[in-house]
């Protein structure tokens, strides 16, 4: 029985060239988290495994940093980074929970005049 819920930063925006922290939090469950995957569309960005720690996909090593916590930091953002990001929590005994974040990377001048999206 899956009783937990994933809380995410929801829809967020960031400036081109800047950094952003993607954060998910699993609540309302006592399930043991065995692994967290971070994915962009169908591309694996990183894994945080209970036994092995962090693994960053080689193609993202230069621009992705682990943490804080089970979150993920994206650096040197480009407009191409705009899109959906998913945190996938593998837990026992509940199973798999998925959270979604939409990131919009804005040109500097647009970002300076305020983000279109607010963190809930």
């Amino acid at each position: 029985m899956m009783t937990g819920t994933i809380e995410t930063t929801g829809n967020i925006s960031a400036e081109k060239g800047g950094s952003i922290i993607l954060q998910c939090h699993l609540s309302s469950t006592t399930a043991q988290v065995t692994q967290v995957n971070w994915e962009q569309q169908d591309q694996l960005l990183a894994i945080c495994n209970a036994d092995l720690g962090w693994h960053i996909s080689p193609s993202f090593k230069d621009r992705v940093a682990p943490g804080p916590g089970l979150g993920l930091t994206l650096q040197s953002l480009t407009v191409n980074d705009t899109g959906e990001y998913f945190c996938i929590y593998h837990t026992y005994p509940d199973g798999t929970y998925t959270g979604r974040i939409f990131l919009e990377v804005l040109e500097s001048s647009v970002a300076e005049h305020g983000a279109r999206f607010q963190i809930p």
């Epitope: 899956m2 043991q32 065995t34 692994q35 995957n37 169908d42 694996l44 894994i47 495994n49 209970a50 036994d51 092995l52 693994h55 593998h90 026992y92 005994p93 509940d94 199973g95 798999t96 998925t98």
Partner: antibody
């Protein structure tokens, strides 16, 4: 080349015990979760146990919980399944499987199996 | 436990035929579904994971689709090497469970 070789199967009386082994080669054994899956003669597949890469957690279905124990020796690249209080319905071909590091439920490599027969 | 129901349980087809196997989960499993192929006397082999992603080395005639509770494995043009039993497996929640299998036989 990934290779998984099971051994230790045989004929055992109901209530008896048996210990299966799986020798792994061709990959970094200590970096992968491992499972046992069984197949009764002429029947389908049933997942029996999983152990994390470092051995910090083990999970079982209710059908074997309390009777079977999965363990591993990363220094010997070997996976084990200790089966106690065996029943006729435990008769099956037992496969050792490697779990995909990205998605722990995926069995990406399988051994050829070792046959366990529980009969008086 | 989540029940996985495959249909048909067996089918007869000819080389070159398009073959479709379905798998239904008793509750939502998102895309956490794998397909395996097993030949007589052999170990199962991973074909597809995450409902539609082809495993390494698997021919492109195999494809998977679906999400939620309904999934499909399609072989676009059946080859002699494809006569086997196919199993689906869910990874949404413990215990991981398999479908009962679909045996693809030569017509």
């Amino acid at each position: 080349e990934v290779k998984l070789v099971e051994s230790g199967g045989g004929l055992v009386q109901p209530g008896g015990s048996l210990r299966l082994s799986c020798a792994a080669s061709g990959f970094a054994f200590s970096s992968f979760d491992m499972s046992w899956v069984r197949q009764a003669p002429g029947k389908g597949l049933e997942w029996v146990a999983v152990i994390s890469s470092g051995g910090s957690y083990t999970f079982y279905p209710d059908s074997v919980k309390g009777r079977f124990t999965i363990s591993r020796d990363n220094s010997k690249n070997t996976l084990y399944l200790q089966m106690n209080s065996l029943r006729a319905e435990d008769t099956a071909l037992y496969f050792c499987t490697r779990q995909d590091y990205r998605y722990p439920y995926i069995m990406d490599y399988w051994g050829q199996g070792t046959l366990v027969t529980v009969s008086s | 436990a989540i029940q996985m129901t495959q249909s048909p349980s067996s089918l007869s087809a000819s080389v070159g035929d398009r073959v479709t196997i379905t798998c239904q989960a008793s509750q939502n499993i998102n895309v956490w579904l794998s397909w395996y192929q097993q030949k007589p006397g052999k170990a199962p082999k991973l074909l597809i994971y995450k409902a539609s992603t082809l495993a390494s080395g698997v021919p492109s005639r195999f494809s998977g689709s679906g999400s939620g509770t309904d999934f499909t494995l399609t072989i676009s043009s059946l080859q002699p090497d494809d006569f086997a039993t196919y199993y689906c497996q869910q990874g949404q929640s413990y215990p991981w469970t398999f479908g009962g299998g679909t045996k693809v036989e030569i017509k």
